[in-house]
Interface confidence: low
């Protein structure tokens, strides 16, 4: 998929694209192919949908093999009534600073978190809100009763005296990290996004996984028995290879899939877990990628339309969002 | 003009080691894989291995244990190592470039007997 | 063992359109199976005609295309000429190697 080879091109005719899919020159300048659109995957020889502000996102400068479409202005966020551009930073209060990356918001609050323990100079440390500030101060009250300043120094240890640990670097950041979106697929190898600050710097980054709800190929229906309306979970009688990009997953896995139902309803993952998958490409390259795994599948009637453009955003509540 | 040229000896002894080298013109072993590939007489084609632009490689499992190929990027050479032949091995070995299969050696015939 | 099958024999006239196939014995062919398509002439040279299911390799006319029909790799050769008639094998590949079809004879009538 790189552009060493000389240009060697499906088809001499230019190819017939979808309505509102840009027909382009692929990134090696060699030959015209219809745009991959946001979600999907991308190559250096499958480029995104100019036109529509799309880049290939790589992840990490080391993986320049396979990357998902993204938005360069990315969704905009509605938060406490106003929009934000993503990218863009704001002060939801004086207490939050707060920053829209694709839809999602995360914030870091602004005020110390800290952990204050009694010592001999302040035996019973207290926060209290200051006329004038905004953040709360810590204030040292003297004990009613003398006495009781020995029980109280039992809390205090010398460690806590000997500078900052490592590991506390993100004392002060309020983790968040959104729920997985749909896969960007209903059949086959699609894309799943969610937005964290969970790492060393309490930095907004958007991860990506690789999902299967189901294969495109099976036909599920047919295993649905008699009198029943769906099948969640149908068994899939052999172990399969993940295919991607022309890329073979290196071992064999016994995923679970989503089923389908014939009453309207659809069936997509429940519980879910991450885990890395090794692929091998015919040029001999290994590369790992996170996908998603299905523990359990959910049928119900809160089904995503067809080509949504924002069905993904359906499913973008953050955990512990104070709105 | 993109070449490809096989060379190695035309007879080896049951047991012995063949070693074949692909010279390659016209285009840069960092940018291209080089494939072997042989053709009993009167027959089809069997895939042997391949040594890929970055130098990993990938091998018939059938040949695993017996097969190396290794290459020198400066000289554009390949070397193909196969040890323990016997007389089944008869065959001509080609060389071919990665994209395609899209170009060949012209093939060296190598017959193994005692 | 993964088997790859072609027909072993083929024959066309002049100025004639033939398809030739390759089939998997472990499933259907996908674009994963990079399909590559080598012809040999009656002389034994080997040349490339299609990399990667439908690239066609440099200097190859237009006459010939790949493709997938069905759950089998294509060689579709449209106004056969005498210079045709050669054996044409089909490789694909399997994760970690590639398998060679036993190739088919194409036969220009006339």
């Known amino acids: 998929q790189d552009c060493s080879a000389q240009c060697q091109c499906a088809a001499e005719a230019a190819p017939h694209c979808p309505a509102g899919v840009s027909l382009v020159l692929d990134g090696c300048g060699c030959c015209r192919v219809c745009a991959k659109q946001l979600g999907e995957l991308c190559t250096e020889r499958d480029p995104c949908d100019p036109h529509k502000g799309l880049f290939c996102d790589f992840g990490s400068p080391a993986n320049r093999k396979i990357g998902v479409c993204t938005a360069k202005d990315g969704a905009p966020c509605v938060f406490g009534g106003s929009v934000y551009r993503s990218g863009e930073s704001f002060q939801s209060s004086c207490k939050y600073q707060c920053t829209c990356l694709d839809g999602a918001v995360g914030c870091v609050p602004l005020c110390s978190m800290d952990v204050r323990l009694p010592s001999p100079d302040c035996p019973f440390p207290r926060r209290v809100k200051l006329p004038g500030k905004c953040c709360e101060e810590w204030v040292c009250d003297e004990p009613k009763d003398r006495t009781a300043v020995g029980p109280a120094l039992a809390a205090y240890r010398l460690e806590d005296t000997f500078g900052p640990d490592p590991t506390m670097m993100r004392a002060n950041c309020l983790v968040q990290t959104t729920e997985w979106s749909a896969c960007s697929k209903t059949c086959g190898m699609g894309i799943s996004t969610r937005v964290t600050n969970d790492n060393t710097f309490c930095r907004l980054e958007k991860q990506s996984r690789l999902c299967m709800v189901r294969p495109c190929e099976a036909d599920l229906e047919e295993n649905i028995k008699k009198g029943k309306k769906c099948i969640r979970t149908p068994k899939i009688a052999k172990p399969v290879k993940f295919e991607l990009s022309g890329c073979t997953s290196v071992k064999t896995y016994r995923a679970k899939f989503c089923g389908v139902c014939t009453d309207g309803r659809c069936c997509t993952p429940h519980r879910t877990t991450t885990l890395p998958v090794e692929f091998k490409c015919p040029d001999g390259e290994i590369m790992k990628k996170n996908m998603m795994f299905i523990k359990t599948c959910a049928c119900h009637y809160n089904c995503p339309g067809d080509n949504d453009i924002f069905e993904s955003l359906y499913y973008r509540k953050m955990y512990g969002d104070m709105a | 003009e993109v070449t490809l040229k096989e060379s190695g000896p035309v007879l080896v002894k049951p047991t012995e080691t063949l070693t074949l080298t692909c010279t390659v013109s016209?285009?840069?072993?960092?940018?291209?894989?080089v494939h072997w590939i042989r053709q009993p007489p009167g027959k089809g084609l069997e895939w042997l291995g391949v040594?890929?632009?970055?130098?990993?490689?990938d091998y018939n499992a059938a040949f695993m244990s017996r097969l190396t190929i290794s290459k020198d990027t400066s000289k554009s050479q390949v070397v193909f190592t196969m040890t323990n032949m016997d007389p089944v091995d008869t065959a001509t070995y080609y060389c071919?470039?990665?994209?395609?299969?899209?170009?060949w050696g012209q093939g060296t015939t190598v017959t193994v007997s005692s | 063992e993964t088997v790859v099958t072609q027909e072993p024999s083929f024959s066309v006239s002049p100025g004639g359109t033939v398809t030739l196939t390759c089939r998997s014995s472990?499933?259907?062919?996908?674009?994963?199976?990079?399909a590559n398509w080598v012809q040999q002439t009656p002389g034994q040279a080997f040349r490339g005609l299609i990399g990667?299911?439908?690239n066609r390799a440099p200097g190859v006319p237009d006459r010939f295309s790949g493709s997938i029909l069905g759950n089998k790799a294509a060689l579709t050769i449209t106004g056969a000429q005498a210079d045709d008639e050669s054996d044409y094998y089909c490789?694909?590949?399997?994760?970690?190697?590639?398998?060679f079809g036993g190739g088919t004879k194409l036969t220009v009538l006339g």
């Open positions: 990667g299911t439908s």
């Open positions: 490789a694909l590949w399997y994760s970690t190697h590639y398998v």
């Open positions: 071919a470039r990665d994209g395609g299969f899209d170009y």
């Open positions: 016209g285009f840069s072993l960092s940018t291209f894989g």
């Open positions: 472990i499933g259907a062919v996908t674009t994963s199976n990079y």
């Open positions: 040594i890929w632009r970055r130098g990993g490689t």
